[in-house]
């Protein structure tokens, strides 16, 4: 049969070379003379000519030693063929599997591994996994099976054998109690990687374990008692630097402070910070203090660290005495914005409201009063009483100056200290309406046709608040009603104007008075432009030319 | 000479407590592991808990875990395990070791613990 | 069930030998050299025979002695006395929690 069972040849052969491997033998040569030959990776295409075969006898030969971890398997075709060239047999399959030799050592994956872990910690606790690779096969044979141990451990405190190392994983854990980070604070352990599973090649590689400090020391404070002057109302203000001391690792979540407030801050007035780099509490002010209420405050600051105590750890606490110091302060008016409800239109010198302010310091200080901004120049303040009284008029419909209803003014208070400080107020007068705006026609010229004409629909504004607007009446003077009608709708809003009487081209004025519903008439003129023409127009058509 | 000696065992009602005292003596307390491992009548050897020298880290088995603690008191040599939320199936001699990471040594010689109603 | 897998019972006459196994996986027995061995006498506390597989404490008889082989340790007792009648545990450390598992102990009686 044209068939050839899959051919192993160990990797590393010594040869000599060419080696037959098999023959290839075709039934058909009882017939006529057969020649054959091989294709494929490894005989006519790369890795080209390591593989061959007798043309005439089919011998399969090898021509130089193989290497499994370059190519684990070679896959070629056989050819028969006659001696015209004609092909006497189908491409057969020829498969040649390269056996694996321990020929390579195990590999480290570093030279060197880092890992850490906590001192005090169980037995059993894992530090980290190390890795070696061999290139030999792991699954037919031990060449490439790689078993782990820890060959030596530096320094041997407090014993040899603090550390093991997991045969097949590469997994190192604690063995033995007694990790102390102040006594050892690092292990270098020399590792192995042996193949054949722990009977074959061997090699090393170093595995550093760093002993991570626990919280096992109280932070303390040095000193234990601070006394510390701060101005009153400074916010954010450094009061105290607080120093501790630690005896774990710098810099570690078990040496860094952790400060608290534990008394004496009712008011919530201060906060407590940990400087990064020395350690220290800055204790700060969150809000101003007030010298007139409190004078003195007595807080009780303990202090943990980021990591928690490991065991129970009695905390240091420090008491610091804040002594408040009196500075001059702002008088602040009361309230700070206030409303007050004026009707605009008030005549001038009439008074508007009194706005005063507050010192809060204890001292009888005298407080002067002016207005820092009034944009309309509506207003006077008395220096003295604190007394705006209006000194223009009071327009709510001043759009430029009022809005929603409301004139913003700024009036300032200073008080005698020295230096003297100064406190600023809001006024906001709410203007109260009052009819002094009469209604208003839009839009107030209007093109109309002298025959059929369009009724003009005019809107109706009035610039004050209900009840001084609608509903709104309509009336003709100056005889405008010969020829016009004017008829305010139902609801009160709009006015309709229409032309009853023929005029001719041209320009007229219509004399329109409308009233509010408080009566407040307003008389206005409507330039309406008479067209000859039939309907709705909306500009006068040029005369007509014959031609 | 290295000695552990446990107390505090009884009879106890199912969902009572007890604690557990372990005394040490002859060796440097703190700085071993220890554990308990207990031993239902007629049954095998159970690991219940460990901690470490200084107190910081702890081991529990699933079957006590959340209802026993284990502390230590370094300045008094002893062990304790606190035991709460009993069950008839916590029933057993209950022996204090120290865990030296491949193997326990010294043992105490036991307390009964008896949760019956 | 036990973590470890021993014989629940092994006998033989004062001046045999006798082989106790004690069974685990890869992760335990077969990845580290802590298997240890305990002897407990009825009603009293356990008492380490053997630890690191075949190092014996001091005050510990040589008839005793361990060995092991891919995942199985044995404990080995030769010219077998009558106060060797006792139940042996084994134990091995493993990385995983619980670090230390237990077999389910064998009893040795002494004919």
């Known amino acids: 049969d044209w068939v050839v069972a899959p051919i192993s040849v160990p990797e590393n052969g010594k040869g000599p070379f060419p080696q037959r491997l098999n023959q290839l033998k075709s039934n058909k040569d009882r017939d006529t003379k057969i020649f054959y030959s091989i294709t494929g990776p490894g005989a006519d295409s790369p890795p080209e000519g390591v593989f061959a075969v007798e043309k005439e006898t089919g011998w399969l030969l090898l021509n130089k030693p193989l290497d499994r971890e370059e190519i684990a398997k070679y896959e070629l075709f056989g050819h028969a063929v006659s001696e015209n060239g004609a092909s006497v047999e189908d491409p057969m399959n020829i498969s040649i599997i390269v056996t694996d030799q321990n020929d390579h050592k195990p590999k480290f994956t570093q030279d060197t591994f880092r890992g850490s872990v906590l001192e005090g910690v169980l037995p059993g606790t894992s530090v980290m996994q190390v890795t070696a690779t061999d290139e030999d096969d792991a699954i037919y044979t031990y060449n490439g099976v790689v078993a782990y141990s820890i060959h030596s451990q530096e320094p041997k405190d407090p014993h040899d054998l603090m550390f093991t190392i997991h045969r097949s994983t590469g997994t190192i854990s604690v063995i033995s109690s007694g990790l102390d980070r102040e006594k050892v604070p690092e292990y270098t352990l020399t590792i192995q990687a042996t193949d054949m599973d722990g009977d074959g090649s061997t090699t090393t590689a170093v595995a550093v374990v760093e002993i991570l400090d626990a919280n096992d020391n109280a932070p303390m404070f040095d000193p234990q008692k601070y006394e510390a002057h701060v101005p009153e109302n400074a916010v954010g203000h450094e009061v105290q630097r607080l120093t501790v001391t630690d005896l774990d690792a710098p810099n570690s979540p078990a040496w860094r402070a952790t400060y608290l407030i534990m008394g004496g801050d009712d008011g919530d007035h201060f906060t407590i910070t940990t400087h990064p780099e020395s350690n220290q509490g800055i204790l700060t002010t969150r809000k101003g203090l007030d010298f007139e209420a409190k004078n003195q405050h007595t807080l009780y600051v303990e202090v943990t660290n980021e990591a928690p105590f490991v065991l129970k750890l009695p905390t240091s606490t420090a008491t610091i005495v804040v002594h408040v110091e009196d500075v001059n302060e702002a008088p602040v008016f009361v309230p700070p914005s206030k409303v007050v409800e004026v009707q605009e239109g008030i005549p001038t010198g009439e008074p508007v409201c009194v706005y005063t302010a507050e010192d809060p310091d204890k001292e009888n200080q005298k407080i002067s009063y002016r207005i820092l901004r009034d944009p309309a120049g509506w207003l006077a303040m008395d220096p003295d009483s604190g007394q705006v009284t209006a000194v223009g008029t009071l327009d709510r419909e001043d759009e430029q100056f009022v809005r929603n209803n409301i004139y913003e003014v700024m009036v300032l208070a200073m008080d005698n200290g020295s230096p003297p400080t100064t406190g600023t107020g809001t006024l906001l007068l709410t203007l109260i309406d009052v009819n002094d705006h009469g209604p208003v026609p839009e839009p107030r010229q209007i093109t109309i046709c002298n025959q059929s004409p369009v009724r003009q629909v005019l809107n109706i504004t009035d610039k004050d608040l209900s009840p001084h607007t609608s509903p709104f009446q309509a009336q003709l003077t100056d005889d405008s009603d010969i020829y016009w009608t004017a008829e305010v709708n139902e609801e009160g809003d709009t006015v309709v104007l229409s032309l009853k009487k023929f005029l001719k081209q041209d320009t007229y004025d219509v004399h329109l008075s409308l009233s509010d519903h408080g009566n407040k008439e307003q008389l206005t003129v409507i330039r309406a432009t008479v067209c000859d023409c039939h309907g709705h127009v909306e500009t006068c058509p040029g005369p007509w030319k014959g031609g | 000479e290295v000695q552990l000696l446990e107390s505090g065992g009884g009879l106890v009602q199912p969902g009572g407590s007890l604690r557990l005292s372990c005394a040490a003596s002859g060796f440097t307390f703190s700085s071993y592991a220890m554990s308990w491992v207990r031993q239902a009548p007629g049954k095998g050897l159970e690991w219940v808990s460990a901690?470490?020298?200084?107190?910081?880290?702890?081991y529990y088995a699933d079957s006590v875990k959340g209802r026993f603690t284990i502390s230590r008191d370094n300045s008094k040599n002893t062990l304790y395990l606190q035991m709460n939320s009993l069950r008839a199936e916590d029933t057993a001699v209950y022996y204090c070791?120290?865990?030296?990471?491949?193997?326990?040594?010294?043992w105490g010689q036991g307390t009964m613990v008896t949760v019956s109603s | 069930q036990s973590a470890l897998t021993q014989p629940a019972s092994v006998s033989g006459s004062p001046g045999q030998s006798i082989t106790i196994s004690c069974t685990g996986t890869s992760n335990d027995v077969g990845a580290y050299n802590y298997v240890s061995w305990y002897q407990q006498h009825p009603g009293k506390a356990p008492k380490l025979i053997l630890s690191?597989?075949?190092k014996r404490p001091s005050g510990v008889s040589n008839r005793f002695s361990g060995s092991k082989s891919g995942n199985t340790a044995s404990l080995s007792i030769s010219g077998l006395q009558a106060e060797d009648e006792a139940d042996y545990y084994c134990?091995?450390?493993?990385?995983?929690?619980?670090?230390?598992?237990f077999g389910g102990g064998t009893k040795l009686t002494v004919l």
């Open positions: 070791a120290s865990w030296g990471g491949g193997w326990f040594d010294p």
């Open positions: 690191e597989v075949n």
């Open positions: 901690i470490s020298g200084s107190g910081g880290s702890t």
């Open positions: 134990s091995s450390f493993t990385s995983q929690i619980p670090w230390a598992l």
